[in-house]
Structures are given as structure tokens and as C-alpha cells.
């Protein structure tokens, strides 16, 4: 049987992207990161 036409089946979840920079002291420079949904990924 042929398939009935449906969408891709993948749901889109909208999440907040937060870029941040954190000063960790003059001798260590800064950490720059990207947080997606509360998890730091970069």
C-alpha cells in the first residue's frame, strides 16, 4: 500500500538561546559560551 501523506513527523521545539561572557580573572581571560535550553553547548 502507498503511504497516506503526512508531515515529517519531527516536532519543532522553540528554545531560548543565550550568549554570555564570564570574567574569570585578569590572568585567565574570559569564558564565552552559548547556552541552549539551560545547557551550555559551546
Amino acid at each position: 500500500d502507498a503511504e497516506f501523506r503526512h508531515d515529517s513527523g519531527y516536532e519543532v521545539h522553540h528554545q531560548k538561546l543565550v550568549f554570555f561572557a564570564e570574567d574569570v580573572g585578569s590572568n585567565k581571560g574570559a569564558i564565552i559560551g552559548l547556552m541552549v535550553g539551560g545547557v551550555v553547548i559551546a
Epitope: 500500500d1 502507498a2 503511504e3 497516506f4 501523506r5 503526512h6 508531515d7 515529517s8 513527523g9 519531527y10 516536532e11
Partner: antibody, heavy 122, light 112 residues
Framework: QVTLKESGPALVKPTQTLTLTCTFS??????????VSWIRQPPGKALEWLAH???????LYNPSLKSRLTISKDTSKNQVVLTMTNMDPVDTATYYC??????????????WGQGTTVTVSS | DIVMTQTPLSLPVTPGEPASISCRSS???????????LEWYLQKPGQSPQLLIY???NRFSGVPDRFSGSGSGTDFTLKISRVEAEDVGVYYC?????????FGGGTKVEIK
């Protein structure tokens, strides 16, 4: 709110062509993913899916009836029309239209018309 | 065509008691997109069918939580935790994964 209503002749003669119209409100067939199906139910029997038309004019048919069926839509009138040729007494049934939108969480026939009863007899 | 087989054909129930309807498909109804388009509809006496459950286990808007759907592959079940008088009618399972979509023969639920 979403409503659908079927209309057509209550009685047709064998060999004649049946034309049914589904007039709907509360949604548009120009909306991406939207579609309308026709389903029938002979007296005291189960449901049988007949055909479906999508917002982009793609249509699907039940292979067992494909040679007899044509489904079309008039988006401006909010109508879907089903024609069935060479009617036979076994086609006596209540005919329903129902909407199904495939690009949504609820991908199912979520709203149905009240049905129209068609008797095939000479 | 995919054949949908429902059991039992008739189900007499006592109000307040649970009820269960089985539906089996003649082959897998998992769509290539990963979803299983198994639906349950209720046709109350003299009315049009109405959607209860979609994609195996999701309750449609306004459907009481006493209704639940489960299953996978080819074996599916509709359960009513506590049957009420308004639940009487014919229940149909339907697969919408392949053409043509096909319905089960129906299960008539009636009050004892």
C-alpha cells in the same frame, strides 16, 4: 467553530452519477496541511474511507473505487465535491465528510459532518 | 488494504466498571516518518463519528481522561477506566498510515 455539512440527492437511480457537496466553515482549505476526506457507512455496517483532497490539490482515492470517484475543491466557496459514477444499490449509505490537517499535532479526522443518506434504487 | 480487526464485537458493561477494546492491524502501521496513525472514533446512536484518540495514545480535546489508548506495531487497545452511560455507542479503530485508511468493524458498547 469548525463545522462541515454534506448535501446531495437522497435518492439516485442505478447507473446514475452521484454528486455530493461538503460545505464547511471555521477553517480554510488554503491553509497549509489542511484536507478533507469523504467516508461512507452502509446501513448497520462499518465505515469506509473513499477519498481525500489536500490544500495543494493533491488527491488520494480508495483503490477499490478509484475508477468511479472524483474529488475536487472550491477554496473560495469553502466546498469539497465528490462525484461517484455508475451508482449501484450496494452504494446505499450515509456519506460523511471530515477534515484532517496533516501539519499539526492532531493529525486525525477531528471534525465530521452530520452525514447525508443516499439510497440507490430504481 | 490493511485489515483492522476489532474484538469483541459487542461489549455489555456495568456503569463504573472498566472496559477494554482490542484492535489488530494485518501489518505494521508505522509511517515512514516514525509516527503511528492509529485513531479511535466513537459513534453514538444516531450521530456522526467523533474523534477520541489520535496517534495511538493522545486524547483529543474535550475527551474525558477515563479514555486511554495504548499499543504499538500491530496491536492496540482502547481502555475506559470507568464506563458511564454516555459512553454507549460503536467504537471504531482506524489506521491512517497507508492508503486506503481503513476502519475496524466496530465494537458496540452497551450498558448491562
Amino acid at each position: 467553530q469548525v463545522t462541515l455539512k454534506e448535501s446531495g440527492p437522497a435518492l439516485v437511480k442505478p447507473t446514475q452519477t452521484l454528486t455530493l457537496t461538503c460545505t464547511f466553515s471555521g477553517f480554510s482549505l488554503s491553509t497549509s496541511g489542511m484536507g478533507v476526506s469523504w467516508i461512507r457507512q452502509p446501513p448497520g455496517k462499518a465505515l469506509e474511507w473513499l477519498a481525500h483532497i489536500y490544500w495543494d490539490d493533491v488527491s488520494l482515492y480508495n483503490p477499490s473505487l478509484k475508477s468511479r470517484l472524483t474529488i475536487s475543491k472550491d477554496t473560495s466557496k469553502n466546498q469539497v465535491v465528490l462525484t461517484m459514477t455508475n451508482m449501484d444499490p450496494v452504494d446505499t449509505a450515509t456519506y460523511y465528510c471530515a477534515r484532517r490537517r496533516i501539519i499539526t499535532v492532531v493529525d486525525a479526522m477531528d471534525y465530521w459532518g452530520q452525514g447525508t443518506t443516499v439510497t440507490v434504487s430504481s | 488494504d490493511i485489515v483492522m480487526t476489532q474484538t469483541p464485537l459487542s461489549l455489555p458493561v456495568t456503569p463504573g466498571e472498566p472496559a477494554s477494546i482490542s484492535c489488530r492491524s494485518s501489518q505494521s502501521i508505522v509511517h515512514s516518518n516514525g509516527n503511528t496513525y492509529l485513531e479511535w472514533y466513537l459513534q453514538k446512536p444516531g450521530q456522526s463519528p467523533q474523534l477520541l484518540i489520535y496517534k495511538v495514545s493522545n486524547r483529543f480535546s474535550g475527551v474525558p481522561d477515563r479514555f486511554s489508548g495504548s499499543g504499538s506495531g500491530t496491536d492496540f487497545t482502547l481502555k475506559i477506566s470507568r464506563v458511564e452511560a454516555e459512553d454507549v455507542g460503536v467504537y471504531y479503530c482506524c489506521q491512517g498510515s497507508r492508503v486506503p485508511p481503513t476502519f475496524g468493524g466496530g465494537t458496540k458498547v452497551e450498558i448491562k
